[in-house]
């Protein structure tokens, strides 16, 4: 009986199992009883990841920098190209087909983890003890000024956003 | 034992027919592909023909194409192979070969075509 | 079509010898080739497959090695049975294609 069903790395075609063509190469003509699986290595700028029957390879990704893009990792004939953003940006997907500037922590927040090329700034509030003043991508809250340890005294409460203000303690007079 | 036996060669003239025949036994014939190799008078091996299993699909040699038709009856475990508008270059002993995994592992003892005027 | 060609056309050994045949596709063939041994008269035999298999009941005094454009057979050891014509031919493109043959004849 013909076979219904074929070993990994082969496709059944007119009741005969043919061998895939494997990564980097596409598919030229199906195979016979008389000759083996006719394959071509992909051209330049294409690239084929999985043992495959495709007729056609697929393009490299291309890193637009219109849209903030870099290349990250060169594509091969077997891998796609890898894109990144420009310093400042993250990709706005896992596949990284666009870019967006990383966001600011407000004041009153400060940044918990600091941007990458995939990933935006995580902000978080500033706790009690801690404050910020600007609007920043990479500063952390920063924590109170201790007036104690300068033999100062709080004149004023530090906020989320504001230090503390020191002055000089009362004189007895 | 697998068996392949040629028979129907002979003396013919150019743009004459002749049909080929080769018996098999010994072994399930349809589950089989099976081709037509030939071999010119003190030359080397060409490949004229295959026919695949299960009524699969036929192939030629450019030089044949048009001119050759291989078959095969299952029914009766017989390969042919129709050669028509022969040409004096088609001279040669005509083996019939079993395929398996792309190899030819049983050959007939081959059959002499001569085409002469 | 694939131009296979071998090298030597013929060769003469002595009984004992260790032979080297060569064969060379026109264009890269991967592992897809076959040996074959005919003697004067007779059919061709199966020798070796997919380019470095032995084929069943074969003498393991021959193997085959290579893939892509560049294949050799050898025979570790020369038997007297052993002189004979060998054709090495591509299953990588249709149509399937043989060398020209190497006569190994004795010394």
């Known amino acids: 009986e013909p076979p219904t069903a074929c070993r990994e790395k082969q496709y059944l075609i007119n009741s005969q199992c043919c061998s895939l063509c494997q990564p980097g190469q596409k598919l030229v003509s199906d195979c016979t009883e008389f000759t083996e699986t006719e394959c071509l290595p992909c051209d330049s700028g294409e690239f084929s990841a999985q043992w495959n029957r495709e007729i056609r390879c697929h393009q490299h990704k291309y890193c637009d920098p219109n849209l903030g893009l870099r290349v990250q990792q060169k594509g091969t004939s077997e891998t796609d190209t890898i894109c990144t953003c420009e310093e400042g940006w993250h990709c706005t997907s896992e596949a990284c087909e666009s870019c967006v500037l990383h966001r600011s922590c407000s004041p009153g927040f400060g940044v918990k983890q600091i941007a990458t090329g995939v990933s935006d700034t995580i902000c978080e509030p500033c706790p009690v003890g801690f404050f910020s003043n600007v609007s920043s991508a990479f500063e952390k809250c920063h924590p109170w000024t201790s007036c104690e340890t300068k033999d100062l005294v709080v004149q004023q409460a530090g906020t989320n956003k504001t230090d503390v203000v020191c002055g000089p303690q009362d004189r007895l007079r | 034992e697998v068996q392949l036996l040629e028979s129907g060669g002979g003396l013919v003239q150019p743009g004459g027919s002749l049909r080929l025949s080769c018996a098999a036994s010994?072994?399930?014939?349809?589950?089989?592909?099976m081709s037509w190799v030939r071999q010119a008078p003190g030359k080397g091996l060409e490949w004229v023909s295959g026919i695949g299993s299960y009524g699969g699909g036929t192939y030629y040699a450019d030089s044949v194409k048009g001119r050759f038709t291989i078959s095969r009856d299952n029914s009766k475990n017989t390969l042919y192979l129709q050669m028509n508008s022969l040409r004096a270059e088609d001279t040669a002993v005509y083996y019939c070969?079993?395929?398996?995994?792309?190899?030819?592992?049983?050959w007939g003892q081959g059959t002499l075509v001569t085409v002469s005027s | 079509d694939i131009q296979m060609t071998q090298s030597p056309s013929s060769l003469s050994a002595s009984v004992g010898d260790r032979v080297t045949i060569t064969c060379r596709a026109s264009q890269s063939i991967s592992s897809y080739l076959n040996w074959y041994q005919q003697k004067p008269g007779k059919a061709p035999k199966l020798l070796i497959y997919a380019a470095s298999s032995l084929q069943s009941g074969v003498p393991s005094r021959f193997s085959g090695s290579g893939s892509g454009t560049d294949f050799t057979l050898t025979i570790s050891s020369l038997q007297p049975e052993d002189f004979a014509t060998y054709y090495c031919?591509?299953?990588?493109?249709?149509?399937?294609?043989f060398g020209q043959g190497t006569k190994l004849e004795i010394k």
């Open positions: 070969a079993r395929y398996v995994n792309f190899g030819m592992d049983y």
């Open positions: 010994g072994f399930t014939f349809s589950s089989y592909a």
């Open positions: 031919q591509q299953y990588g493109r249709n149509p399937p294609t």
